[in-house]
Interface confidence: medium
């Protein structure tokens, strides 16, 4: 069957996000992928969106992330814009209202996004074949 347009948008956003490091992509987030054996796909998407929302809510105006230079400022604002878009699209794909995120494990935002990109690409290859 056809791949969801939302899925294509997510992969596109993730490609943009993982291309460019910012001052805060090394900050840690909850690693929901560490022990996701008994988790449905929809729950994974929902929990990923929750983690991203927590991140940008905490760090949108974090001056450590905004940096000192004009370039750092705009890179961070672009990161936040992409994370919000990703959050919105993941919620749409998940179709769930809320989901618990209780894991103790942490990973950097950069690694989290790379892992999410791998999962999304796998999903895309399945639905496009």
């Amino acid at each position: 069957h056809k791949c969801d347009i939302t899925l294509q948008e997510i992969i596109k956003t993730l490609n943009s996000l993982t291309e460019q490091k910012t001052l805060c992509t090394e900050l840690t987030v909850t690693d929901i992928f560490a022990a996701s054996k008994n988790t449905t796909e929809k729950e994974t998407f929902c929990r990923a969106a929750t983690v991203l929302r927590q991140f940008y809510s905490h760090h949108e105006k974090d001056t450590r992330c905004l940096g000192a230079t004009a370039q750092q400022f705009h890179r961070h604002k672009q990161l936040i814009r992409f994370l919000k878009r990703l959050d919105r699209n993941l919620w749409g794909l998940a179709g769930l209202n809320s989901c618990p995120v209780k894991e103790a494990n942490q990973s950097t935002l950069e690694n989290f996004l790379e892992r999410l990109k791998t999962i999304m690409r796998e999903k895309y290859s399945k639905c496009s074949s």
Epitope: A70, Q71, H74, Q78
Partner: nanobody
Framework: EVQLLESGGGLVQPGGSLRLSCAAS????????MAWVRQAPGKGLEWVSW????????YYADSVKGRFTISRDNSKNTLYLQMNSLRAEDTAVYYC?????????WGQGTLVTVSS
């Protein structure tokens, strides 16, 4: 043609105040975020403050937080920076910049000197 014209700079004593203005023309001012950026003598460019198109969301660099206030009047196509409790380290040329994914247009700048 985009034009940004800063004014209001000058010599002020430490602890004093200044209000910078930036008159914008050549683009639809109300549709764009705007910023103040400064360059101290012998230093690189440092962003100072940013405001969204509607004037509801603002950002400040740590170095000016609590002392500077950015605002805008979309009916007058003007951006402002109220600077209070000025310090010697605030001495710089202050530029207003149009913000569209990056600071894509700059004014000529206005010099602020804080000295006793």
């Amino acid at each position: 043609e985009v034009q940004l014209l800063e004014s209001g700079g000058g010599l002020v004593q430490p602890g004093g105040s200044l209000r910078l203005s930036c008159a914008a023309s050549g683009f639809t001012f109300r549709n764009y975020g705007m910023a103040w950026v400064r360059q101290a003598p012998g230093k690189g460019l440092e962003w100072v403050s940013w405001i969204d198109a509607s004037g509801t969301e603002t950002y400040y660099a740590d170095s000016v937080k609590g002392r500077f206030t950015i605002s805008r009047d979309n009916s007058k196509n003007t951006l402002y920076l109220q600077m209070n409790s000025l310090r010697a380290e605030d001495t710089a040329v202050y530029y207003c910049a149009k913000s569209h994914g990056r600071f894509d247009y700059w004014g000529q700048g206005t010099l602020v000197t804080v000295s006793s």
